[in-house]
């Protein structure tokens, strides 16, 4: 299984996001919250340190609304 100690960078990170999110797309940074004025971004969270599936999923684009 995926070990959270591993990091994901470059093409490997992009391919992994496509696998996790499907073709709906993903963001490299999330909107900053009111608590933290600065959004970290997925490169900082998954390339400079380790991340897991749950964290990767937070960068997926929001699917279009159901009809």
């Amino acid at each position: 299984a995926y070990r959270p100690s591993e990091t994901l960078c470059g093409g490997e990170l992009v391919d992994t996001l496509q696998f996790v999110c499907g073709d709906r797309g993903f963001y490299f940074s999330r909107p900053a919250s009111r608590v933290s004025r600065r959004s970290r971004g997925i490169v900082e969270e998954c390339c400079f340190r380790s991340c897991d599936l749950a964290l990767l999923e937070t960068y997926c684009a929001t699917p279009a609304k159901s009809e």
Epitope: R3, E6, T16, F19, G22, P63
Partner: antibody, heavy 120, light 107 residues
């Protein structure tokens, strides 16, 4: 071109588990994401989940979460799908399907399927 | 989950006919639909990806169209080897889902 090879058939008792294998040959295992798709007799296709073998990152369909485990062994270029608590409704052909990394779900490569029959 | 609804569920046609199979998604999915052909006892085969791109090695008599929620697979002139079951698939958002299939039979 990667070829995905599966074993022919398994017969299992209700309540037991089955582990189906999918061996890649003739290409680069690392360039693919592997999904597992099942097809009950005369029915449609159902995606169970998938894995990026080189990273071990796994995504499951909610329906199977907790009952299915997908793994991969990089050293033998083999992916596995284990399904537990089998019932008669799990009788199906189980396919492994490969999609190129970055296009994980464009299944351009399929194993020949493993028929799993659940019967007492 | 995104539901994919195919119609018709079965279709009878003759060699040389032009046939169209339709697939509707329960929500807008841009152009992220694939089409597969499956023959009895065999694994599915990818024909069309991203709604309209022809997979390498697939005959040009197969074509795909559509975007949003409505998609179509057209076979311009049916050949004997085209009688099979066809499935649509959405890749927009996991869990990946398929249509229930359209069985194309010889009239």
């Amino acid at each position: 071109q990667v070829q995905l090879q599966q074993l022919g058939a398994e017969v299992k008792m209700p309540g037991s588990s089955v582990k189906v294998s999918c061996k890649a040959s003739g290409g680069t295992f690392s360039s693919y994401a592997i999904s597992w798709v099942r097809q009950a007799p005369g029915q449609g296709l159902e995606w169970m989940g998938g894995i990026i073998p080189t990273l071990g990152i796994v995504k499951y369909a909610q329906k199977f979460q907790g009952r299915v485990t997908i793994t991969a062994d990089k050293s033998t270029s083999t992916a596995y799908m284990e399904l537990s608590s089998l019932g008669s409704e799990d009788t199906a052909v189980y396919y492994c399907a490969g999609g190129p990394r970055g296009y994980s779900y464009n299944f351009d490569n399929w194993g020949q399927g493993t028929l799993v029959t659940v019967s007492s | 989950d995104i539901q994919m609804t195919q119609s018709p569920s079965s279709l009878s046609a003759s060699v040389g006919d032009r046939v169209t199979i339709v697939c509707r998604a329960s929500q807008t999915i841009s152009r992220y639909v694939n089409w597969y052909q499956q023959k009895p006892g065999k694994a599915p085969k990818l024909l069309i990806y991203a709604a309209s791109s022809l997979q390498s090695g697939v005959s040009s008599r197969f074509s795909g169209s559509g975007s949003g929620t409505e998609f179509a697979l057209t076979i311009s002139s049916l050949q004997p080897e085209d009688f099979a079951t066809y499935f649509c698939q959405q890749t927009y958002s996991p869990p990946i889902t398929f249509g229930q299939g359209t069985r194309l039979e010889i009239k």
